[in-house]
Amino acid sequence: VPRWRQQWSGPGTTKRFPETVLARCVKYTEIHPEMRHVDCQSVWDAFKGAFISKHPCNITEEDYQPLMKLGTQTVPCNKILLWSRIKDLAHQFTQVQRDMFTLEDTLLGYLADDLTWCGEFNTSKINYQSCPDWRKDCSNNPVSVFWKTVSRRFAEAACDVVHVMLNGSRSKIFDKNSTFGSVEVHNLQPEKVQTLEAWVIHGGREDSRDLCQDPTIKELESIISKRNIQFSCKNIYRPDKFLQCVKNPEDSSCTSEI
């Protein structure tokens, strides 16, 4: 008789989740010499230990502490790029501008990027059928708590000028409920971070509006400046040209506004 299983509203654990995490870990540590000391089997065991046999609506940041410890990594604190609702362009940018880092350019971010996972209370099984949805089921689910934990630590590590890429095509360019708006903004340390520079990425080719005037950007500005951090905003009118100019800064067309 099949055992009753909790039906959650979100998609289940990504297929071949353990193998994917392990393979990503091996690949990352091969590419990044500073992380070669990492034992990927221990990383997987710590990752698994954070959610296996636990109720998937009752996960805490403490559950991830062993994994955080194993994945401790130093990135240049003044080369951090945060993003909100525009992950692909942010990743394309750091692939070209190799001295800048998104969270997904770190080991822990790389391991979990685009994956879903959850377990079941009192069983060692991984749930491949469904996992809790943040809105419909619960916020303290394994995936949300993981990203909240790593995002908080990433923001806390930042210093000097921190950049954030924001999607100018969204109705809320800055969304207080996004990971950036709810976690990272509040965990930038004013003692270390002097300036947050927002890059607002335009979607339409003919869009010449100053999206730095958007009410949600002014809301971000207010939150940031009240925390003793300066705020700078720049429109990126042509993201394609922007990337091209990052690749070839000497190009004569790259002196004009992008």
Partner: antibody, heavy 119, light 107 residues
């Protein structure tokens, strides 16, 4: 290019009021904060107030009760209303642009306008 | 308010000399320090922000260093056009306050 031009200075009696203007060009007040800084004759610099691009203001508490900063975005002009003036308010008053959107350092300054409070 | 002190209050040096000015805050200002140059009868000019970042167009002979409460401004090789008064400014907390200035002259 960025330019700031102050006006409205002059000789005024103690207890009277004066309104200084700062006409900005080469940038928009919708994009940058503008500060007032003063310098008494032969003395150092003293930060007075700032008006941010959204219209909110911060003041040096020493001036908050007597001075008011405001702006007219359509004229791209910032104002400093100074009431109940005292002899010790005699100074050159500079307006200056925030280096970045909400910046606390000042990258462009006007030439200053001299305010003399004397009976 | 955060008090800023500068030393020396004035100094005289020869062309080509290395000149150092110090600025001390009454509390930790976490590198939120700017340096300005003011020539006689002129408005101040921003040289350095964030304790160490040289503004665009400012000659590389100017530099800034320091952390916590203590900061230093250096001119590696003094030029005649550097005659001016130099001010530090903290931008950690409002009211943003300036040092009293250091008047630099050529011997």
């Amino acid at each position: 290019q960025v330019q700031l031009v102050e006006s409205g200075g002059g000789v005024v009696q103690p207890g009277r009021s004066l309104r200084l203007s700062c006409a900005a060009s080469g940038f928009s007040l919708l994009s940058y904060g503008v500060h007032w800084v003063r310098q008494a004759p032969g003395k150092g610099l003293e930060w007075v107030a700032v008006i941010w691009r959204g219209g909110s203001a911060d003041y040096n508490a020493a001036f908050m009760s007597r001075f008011t900063i405001s702006k007219d975005n359509s004229k791209n002009t910032v104002y400093l209303q100074m009431n109940s003036l005292r002899a010790e308010d005699t100074a050159v008053y500079y307006c200056a642009k925030s280096m970045i959107t909400t910046g606390f350092t000042l990258d462009y300054w006007g030439q200053g306008t001299l305010v003399t409070v004397s009976s | 308010d955060i008090q800023m002190t500068q030393s020396p209050s004035s100094l005289s040096a020869s062309v080509g000399d290395r000149v150092t000015i110090t600025c001390k805050a009454s509390e930790d200002i976490y590198n939120r320090l700017a340096w300005y140059q003011q020539k006689p009868g002129k408005a101040p000019k921003l040289l350095i922000s964030g304790a160490t970042s040289l503004e665009t167009g400012v000659p590389s002979r100017f530099s800034g260093s320091g952390s916590g409460k203590d900061y230093t401004f250096t001119i590696s090789s003094l030029q005649p056009e550097d005659v001016a008064t130099y001010y530090c400014q903290q931008f950690w907390n409002t009211p943003w306050t300036f040092g009293p200035g250091t008047k630099l002259e050529i011997k």
